[in-house]
């Protein structure tokens, strides 16, 4: 229950990629504003996005403090221009979010192939180690820093003249694969966290092909 001119938020949804984390909800406000609170299971509530007319709140700064914690958020509804007003129970109307554990649930962002280099019949493909917003000692950690060996990359590679995708895997950011001499290959990578049960894969990187700028060819 609440005052007659406010409605509770609904469809509270976490949107998170590489730990950049936003809470979204409905409805678009009509004569009301929202405030968000976030807490760990055992922690105190912290207020964010005070009296906003937005239907999203960036909670990245809070969740990156400990990405392995489980977080809960709630969205309070207040009448516009009368934010002291409360519901009939003496509290503003609010709705709880689902629980969210960033380490287990943040989506893996689209990776990027940084470079590839052919030496004879070997190609070394390097994946960019994307920076996250997770900090340690005042420096931003990379995806590899955060996930360590939990993160692997799958490389799809194929002859430009063919459609079948061979695969290779690495728990570093580098692949060394065998290729046929004189053939041009294309590459795409996918980030994977095999230990997860959901959100295990990223979208595929843009395809990069030999004979384009990113690569280097050396005949031995």
């Amino acid at each position: 229950s609440g005052t007659t001119n406010t409605v509770a938020a609904y469809n509270l949804t976490w949107k998170s990629t590489n730990f950049k984390t936003i809470l979204e909800w409905e409805p678009k406000p009509v004569n009301q504003v929202y405030t968000v609170q976030i807490s760990t299971k055992s922690g105190d509530w912290k207020s964010k996005c005070f009296y906003t007319t937005d239907t999203e709140c960036d909670l990245t700064d809070e969740i990156v403090k400990d990405v392995k914690q489980t977080y809960l958020a709630r969205v309070f509804s207040y009448p516009a221009g009368n934010v002291e007003s409360t519901g009939s129970a003496g509290e503003p109307l609010y709705e709880n979010s689902p629980e969210f554990t960033p380490y287990l649930e943040t989506n893996l962002g689209q990776p990027t192939i940084q470079s590839f280099e052919q030496v004879g019949t070997k190609v070394n493909v390097t994946v960019e180690d994307e920076r996250t917003l997770v900090r340690r000692n005042n420096t931003f950690l990379s995806l590899r820093d955060v996930f360590g060996k939990d993160l692997i990359y799958t490389l799809y590679y194929w002859k430009s003249s063919s459609s079948g995708k061979k695969t290779a895997k690495t728990n570093t950011n580098e692949f060394l694969i065998d290729v046929d001499k004189g053939e041009n290959y294309c590459f795409s990578v996918q980030a994977v966290i095999p230990s997860r049960t959901v959100n295990r894969k990223s979208t595929d990187s843009p395809v990069e092909c030999m004979g384009q700028e990113k690569g280097e060819f050396r005949e031995i």
Epitope: K166, A168, K169, Q190, P194, V198, N199, K201, D204
Partner: antibody, heavy 120, light 107 residues
Framework: EVQLVESGGGLVQPGGSLRLSCAAS????????IHWVRQAPGKGLEWVGY????????YYADSVKGRFTISADTSKNTAYLQMNSLRAEDTAVYYC?????????????WGQGTLVTVSS | DIQMTQSPSSLSASVGDRVTITCRAS??????VAWYQQKPGKAPKLLIY???FLYSGVPSRFSGSRSGTDFTLTISSLQPEDFATYYC?????????FGQGTKVEIK
């Protein structure tokens, strides 16, 4: 519980076609990779091909390339093996299997298999 | 393609025996080798992954090891339910390939 159930096997004439289905439950196929592996009567295991249902990427054994096509319908959580231009040597039990996708673990769950007999 | 040469193709053993099956890869496959057990009319079951790691629920009498491109499956004390066919498989490169299988029969 992870389960894979194949269906669609049967008797088909040489040159004919058949489509096998692999219905998955207990996991979402787009989060994994699906392989087809076959076993001719009294023989060993032969890998047929794989699909990454997330992006549709596939790869096939040379013995079936150009004749077999693997596809997936993520909304039905089901993978398929379309077999065309079938030959007597394609007679086998066909298994679909889940690839866990890590560096270490490869196929961790198998279906019960479905028998395909190619004979006139 | 990488060949996996498995030996022996069959062996006879008694309950309580120590049984060893080997697989040789035609080139380096790192530790990307799995071992499967298959009983007649049934699907294969994963026993060992990454050359030496016991899959969940598999009895500890099964073990795997690697020496270069040679891989070994050992059953320390054969039990009645272990009579089956065993396959090695490499998944280091595409296409993944299986060994020919080893049938373990009752002596």
């Amino acid at each position: 519980e992870v389960q894979l159930v194949e269906s669609g096997g049967g008797l088909v004439q040489p040159g004919g076609s058949l489509r096998l289905s692999c219905a998955a439950s207990g996991f979402t196929i787009s989060d994994y990779w699906i392989h087809w592996v076959r076993q001719a009567p009294g023989k060993g295991l032969e890998w047929v091909g794989y699909i990454d249902p997330y992006n549709g990427y596939t790869y096939y054994a040379d013995s079936v390339k150009g004749r077999f096509t693997i596809s997936a319908d993520t909304s039905k959580n089901t993978a398929y093996l379309q077999m065309n231009s079938l030959r007597a040597e394609d007679t086998a039990v066909y298994y679909c299997a889940r690839d866990y996708g890590s560096l270490q673990v490869f196929i961790d769950h198998w279906g019960q298999g479905t028998l395909v007999t190619v004979s006139s | 393609d990488i060949q996996m040469t498995q030996s022996p193709s069959s062996l006879s053993a008694s309950v309580g025996d120590r049984v060893t099956i080997t697989c040789r890869a035609s080139q380096d496959v790192n530790t990307a080798v799995a071992w499967y057990q298959q009983k007649p009319g049934k699907a294969p079951k994963l026993l060992i992954y990454s050359a030496s790691f016991l899959y969940s629920g598999v009895p500890s009498r099964f073990s795997g090891s690697r020496s270069g491109t040679d891989f070994t499956l050992t059953i320390s004390s054969l039990q009645p339910e272990d009579f089956a066919t065993y396959y090695c498989q490499q998944h280091y490169t595409t296409p993944p390939t299986f060994g020919q299988g080893t049938k373990v029969e009752i002596k």
